[in-house]
Amino acid sequence: IAAHVISEASSKTTSVLQWAEKGYYTMSNNLVTLENGKQLTVKRQGLYYIYAQVTFCSNREASSQAPFIASLCLKSPGRFERILLRAANTHSSAKPCGQQSIHLGGVFELQPGASVFVNVTDPSQVSHGTGFTSFGLLKL
Amino acid sequence: IAAHVISEASSKTTSVLQWAEKGYYTMSNNLVTLENGKQLTVKRQGLYYIYAQVTFCSNREASSQAPFIASLCLKSPGRFERILLRAANTHSSAKPCGQQSIHLGGVFELQPGASVFVNVTDPSQVSHGTGFTSFGLLKL
Amino acid sequence: IAAHVISEASSKTTSVLQWAEKGYYTMSNNLVTLENGKQLTVKRQGLYYIYAQVTFCSNREASSQAPFIASLCLKSPGRFERILLRAANTHSSAKPCGQQSIHLGGVFELQPGASVFVNVTDPSQVSHGTGFTSFGLLKL
């Protein structure tokens, strides 16, 4: 069971990143699915290595004082979402903006029907060029 | 099937990074090989988690305006290469240069004879000290 | 065999990071253990994918000129420790400090009784907020 999906620009105002099965994507079988373009949902309980990579372009003067934060979140059936992993990068002083890449990854127990998704502080700063931003998992 | 190889400084003018089976490297068996010191080639079709880490040292004034970009690329038999993953980091203002590290990783389907390699915008900026820059894969 | 442990602030003056089985941690079975809150120790020989993520907050003026470096280290029975992976990030000019995240990961052969741990140049700069700093491994 494995998946690798590719970032997609979105006009939605949500902080949850959108993904697509496009380009050189992976969706090994129907035991993992991409739901609503935003979350990877697994049918089997078990340990999964889950990862995300987010490239963004921001400028210190044009951004809030808070850093750019990417969070990997878990939503189990009947529960509130919880944060599994976070990474933070202070905005660049480069103009118009400076690109930076964040990588998150870890091993977590998922229940049947659990979903994972990626949340960022400012989705408008995310880079969607080929290979820059992606999200995936693999069952151990 | 798994491999982990170590960066090697090169006098070549190519943007493709060079690797070696040295130090604490891994080459599990002959189903994965390091070819020409530049690419990991697999003999078996399947899903692989492929990763690379690149540490570099650059300065904004001494570099081009474009960021430092590391790309994980795939070359399948009889096809052009394609970019699987990219990460970008704006150059530092530190002098003489500021070190930064990039990590790339994802799950991809590889065909028999497929090769993966790492390309960077400026190989002269790459740090080759122990543990700083490496490249590997594992078959799921 | 898999583990994922969560960073813990420590009053110790050591540069080795401290970890705990808390929050959304993983410890699949007793073939991997967290020893002394600082190292993951495995009982079985084999290939492991080992990873660490470290988020830190530093300022160029308040820090030494040397970059912030995170190292993934191996201690095998009867041997000196050795560095497997390192990542370096130059300190930010943001005030009071600028957050940055480092991710390390690679495939390594471990012997029975081998331990892995994470070392940083300045543990006081490490961020211990939910999800920011973690450490884990999985057996292939």
Epitope: K75, E81, N119 | - | -
Partner: nanobody, 122 residues
């Protein structure tokens, strides 16, 4: 010090609308689920609605489903409750509450605001 400050309550006619706000400080707002709980005059506490840390998951009591909408703005450290089609039985003091920790399977609260009074009457 954790502080939760509710506002937006008042007198409204049946069928009307109100928007409650809860300004949070003293903790990392975006890490915690939050909830609205109410207490009608002479009654016990009633859970109204809850929202996950990043706003992706919402739950509602059957009595308010389809009429109330919970939301949050993590950049402003603020929790909201949009109340439409208000009824007399919605009259209560509304409290915002913070999840005790972001690991609990069942929502347990450790901090509450002082509350804001909503009166629905003609």
């Amino acid at each position: 010090e954790v502080q939760l400050l509710e506002s937006g309550g008042g007198l409204v006619q049946p069928g009307g609308s109100l928007r409650l706000s809860c300004a949070a400080s003293g903790f990392t707002f975006e890490l915690y689920a939050m909830a609205w709980v109410r207490q009608a005059p002479g009654k016990g506490l009633e859970w109204v609605s809850g929202i996950g840390a990043v706003g992706e998951t919402t739950y509602y009591a059957d009595s308010v489903k389809g009429r109330f909408t919970i939301s949050r703005d993590n950049s402003k450290n603020t929790l909201y409750l949009q109340m439409n089609s208000l009824r007399a039985e919605d009259t209560a003091v509304y409290y915002c509450a913070k999840e005790a920790n972001n690991l609990s399977d069942n929502l347990v609260f450790d901090y509450w605001g002082q509350g804001t009074l909503v009166t629905v009457s003609s």
